[in-house]
């Protein structure tokens, strides 16, 4: 099982939408796949996929989850709020037939406020 996550860095405006993608691949077929999105280490959602469908479509505040065969799990945040800023990680585990798990690399989401003046200090603190 392998998990590739993207993008590494995502910067969006407050009120717009953010899309995080997790590509889950396995050489052999699977019957049930448990997936999990975390933000700053806290679980946003932990549904499973079976018969081509997600057991849950909601993932955290304003988060919508979708599965597109053969391998794309998408988390869409809409509308994005300042609280959505953070480090997101996608994790997956084949539960049936055999337990195997993997996780992606971090996606760092930065949300810019509608009023750019609110953001002046934070932008100045970004590494060059």
């Amino acid at each position: 099982l392998s998990v590739q996550q993207g993008p590494n860095l995502l910067q969006v405006r407050q009120g717009s939408q953010a899309t995080l993608v997790c590509q889950v691949d396995q050489a052999t077929a699977w019957e049930r796949l448990r997936v999990k999105w975390t933000k700053d280490g806290a679980i946003l959602c932990q549904p499973y996929i079976t018969n081509g469908s997600l057991s849950l479509g909601v993932c955290g505040p304003q988060g919508r989850l979708s599965w597109q065969a053969p391998s794309h799990l998408t988390l869409q945040l809409d509308p994005v709020s300042l609280n959505h800023s953070g480090a997101y990680v996608c994790w997956a585990a084949v539960e049936i037939p055999e337990l195997e798990e993997a996780e992606g690399n971090i996606t760092r989401l930065f949300v810019d406020p509608d009023d750019p003046t609110q953001n002046r200090n934070r932008i100045a603190s970004f590494p060059g």
Epitope: S2, D25, A27, T28, A29, W30, T50, N51, G52
Partner: antibody
Framework: QVQLQESGPGLVKPSQTLSLTCTVS??????????WSWIRQHPGKGLEWIGY???????YYNPSLKSRVTISVDTSKNQFSLKLSSVTAADTAVYYC????????????WGQGTMVTVSS | DIVMTQSPLSLPVTPGEPASISCRSS????????????LDWYLQKPGQSPQLLIY???NRASGVPDRFSGSGSGTDFTLKISRVEAEDVGVYYC?????????FGDGTKLEIK
């Protein structure tokens, strides 16, 4: 470009352990998402999957051989190995190493094969 | 284990003529989770290692001539060669990777008439 090369003794005595090594060049064997496999072909016959080891060290073996097979990886040498114990004449075959990936689930690169004869 | 059954076992073909090989699996190789059939086709030319022709039942591998095509779903699959050439001789194998153990068909030997 990935290349695989099998090596090991061409003759093994019955009841002994067959040991083969596959050297991987042009690619890191520890790359996530890849499987390193052994497949054999008895003389004039079809192909038989022996087993594979994945990037995390997980092994999957053909149940028909499971009690006698060990596949391992040596990342420092970029090699993976096959050990088949208690061999008999029925283990005489051409042994191939091959690789496949989670994302592209097929054997796209094969070694040239090495003939192993079990005989006293 | 999933049993792969190929037919015919021998296939004499005249150059320029089409050829068709059938492969049947003892259980479905289609996954509704991924919308994929876990079935590949390989050609083993005389004295060589097998080479990939078709993956996931119908996708031609890189560098494979377009005269080769794969079709089918579930348990019944077909490899077709639209116009056989002399270089196509060898043994054709279907193989599943739906689950472990991975298994191959017995092979179809294509020879030129």
């Amino acid at each position: 470009q990935v290349q695989l090369q099998e090596s090991g003794p061409g003759l093994v005595k019955p009841s002994q352990t067959l040991s083969l090594t596959c050297t991987v060049s042009g690619f890191s064997i520890s790359t996530s998402g890849y499987y390193w496999s052994w497949i054999r072909q008895h003389p004039g016959k079809g192909l038989e999957w022996i087993g594979y080891i994945n990037y995390g060290g997980g092994t999957y073996y053909n149940p028909s051989l499971k009690s006698r097979v060990t596949i391992s990886v040596d990342t420092s040498k970029n090699q993976f190995s096959l050990k088949l114990s208690s061999v008999t004449a029925a283990d005489t075959a051409v042994y191939y190493c091959a690789t496949m990936a989670d994302r592209f689930a097929f054997f796209d690169v094969w070694g040239q094969g090495t003939m192993v004869t079990v005989s006293s | 284990d999933i049993v792969m059954t190929q037919s015919p076992l021998s296939l004499p073909v005249t150059p320029g003529e089409p050829a068709s090989i059938s492969c049947r699996s003892s259980q479905s190789l289609f996954s509704s989770n991924t919308n994929r059939n876990y079935l590949d086709w390989y050609l083993q030319k005389p004295g060589q290692s097998p080479q990939l022709l078709i993956y996931h039942a119908s996708n031609r591998a890189s560098g494979v001539p377009d005269r080769f095509s794969g079709s089918g779903s579930g348990t019944d699959f077909t490899l077709k060669i639209s116009r056989v050439e002399a270089e196509d001789v060898g043994v054709y194998y279907c193989q599943h990777h739906y689950e472990t153990p991975l298994t191959f068909g017995d092979g179809t030997k294509l020879e030129i008439k």
